[in-house]
């Protein structure tokens, strides 16, 4: 009786179970009464990452420098190229098909997590006792200056955007 199902890494065709091609190879000819499946290696800049019966290999992804992309990991016959973004940029999606400039944290906000090639800057509001007076992709919120440790007094209260202003203590005459 012809099979109705095949083992793992096989496929059913013309009532026969044929071996799939291994990763890195494409199908040329299905197996026959006389021959095993005929497979050929993928060419330069091509890949197949699964056991397959594909007659064409996939093209490696192109990391387009015009889109801010660069190669993070070169593709092989079994893996696709992995792109990442140039310094100061990050991917717009998981597939990393294009890049955007890292966002900066506005005054009053500090960097909670510095951006990577695949994730944007994460900002957080400066809590009481901290400030940021610049727009930056790297600067965290800085603590207000402690006037007391300098033997000074607060002359102007700090905000989330400004540091405190210290001044000399009033002398009793």
């Amino acid at each position: 009786e012809p099979p109705t199902a095949c083992r793992e890494k096989q496929y059913l065709i013309n009532s026969q179970c044929c071996s799939l091609c291994q990763p890195g190879q494409k199908l040329v000819s299905d197996c026959t009464e006389f021959t095993e499946t005929e497979c050929l290696p993928c060419g330069e800049s091509e890949f197949l990452d699964t056991w397959n019966r594909e007659t064409h290999c996939h093209q490696h992804k192109y990391c387009d420098p015009n889109l801010g992309l660069r190669v993070q990991q070169k593709g092989t016959s079994e893996t696709d190229t992995i792109c990442t973004c140039e310094e100061g940029w990050h991917c717009t999606s998981e597939a990393c098909e294009s890049c955007v400039l890292h966002r900066s944290c506005s005054p009053g906000f500090g960097v909670k997590q510095i951006a990577t090639g695949v994730s944007d800057t994460i900002c957080e509001p400066c809590p009481v006792g901290f400030f940021s007076n610049v727009s930056s992709a790297f600067e965290k919120c800085h603590p207000w200056t402690s006037c007391e440790t300098k033997d000074l007094v607060v002359q102007q209260a700090g905000t989330n955007k400004t540091d405190v202003v210290c001044g000399p203590q009033d002398r009793l005459r």
Partner: antibody
Framework: QVQLQESGPGLVKPSETLSITCTVS????????VYWIRQPPGKGPEWMGM???????DYSTSLKSRLTISKDTSKSQVSLKMSSLTAADTAVYYC???????WGQGTLVTVSS | ELQLTQSPLSLPVTLGQPASISCRSS???????????LHWYLQRPGQSPRLLIY???NRFSGVPDRFSGSGSGTDFTLKISRVEAEDVGVYYC?????????FGGGTKLEIK
């Protein structure tokens, strides 16, 4: 439907080179392999060699040194060339597809002066 | 080069009686992927060989079920349960596991 047809010279002189073409229809030579069989009068069949779908070739050990199999996929043709012929090469030559039971009708080649 | 040895060379059979042909290989015909590419052909007088059985025991389409194949490794058998007049001819075993592919020397079946 699937068809294979050999065309050969019929008569060849000893020491000359034999050229036979197998023209196929109903399938592509880039997806199917074809092999050559010959059968001398009153004897059993002999496998000569094959052309794989991917373009590689395999040859009979005894014929390897004087046999070349090639193909032109665009013309749907597989060619057999065999040099230094002797009377022992007189046979019916068949091209066969490597699945099912698809044979050409065969072409008789006689090697004689 | 792999040798296929068939026996007997000649097989006279009475119509309606069973027949059996043996094919022995000089090395195992099991492929690396677990398939055994041993086949049986019948060549009737004046015709090209016709495939009967492929991969040891699979009847080719249109082949009567009185033909059956069996065996493994190096020993294989073709059986005809009840011989009919149209079964006359030369039977060849053939292997396509190892390059070069090879044929057995043939067994001539004739009616007694």
């Amino acid at each position: 439907q699937v068809q294979l047809q050999e065309s050969g010279p019929g008569l060849v002189k000893p020491s000359e080179t034999l050229s036979i073409t197998c023209t196929v229809s109903g399938f592509s030579l880039s997806r199917y392999s074809v092999y050559w069989i010959r059968q001398p009068p009153g004897k059993g069949p002999e496998w000569m060699g094959m052309m794989w779908g991917g373009g590689s070739t395999d040859y009979s050990t005894s014929l390897k040194s004087r046999l070349t199999i090639s193909k032109d996929t665009s013309k749907s043709q597989v060619s057999l060339k065999m040099s230094s012929l002797t009377a022992a090469d007189t046979a019916v030559y068949y091209c066969v597809r490597t699945d099912g039971d698809y044979w050409g009708q065969g072409t008789l080649v006689t090697v004689s002066s | 080069e792999l040798q296929l040895t068939q026996s007997p060379l000649s097989l006279p059979v009475t119509l309606g009686q069973p027949a059996s042909i043996s094919c022995r290989s000089s090395q195992s015909l099991a492929s690396s992927q677990g398939n055994t590419y041993l086949h049986w052909y019948l060549q009737r007088p004046g015709q090209s060989p016709r495939l009967l059985i492929y991969k040891v025991s699979n009847r080719f389409s249109g082949v009567p079920d009185r033909f059956s194949g069996s065996g493994s490794g190096t020993d294989f058998t073709l059986k005809i349960s009840r011989v009919e007049a149209e079964d006359v001819g030369v039977y060849y075993c053939s292997q396509s596991t190892h390059v070069p592919w090879t044929f057995g020397g043939g067994t001539k079946l004739e009616i007694k």
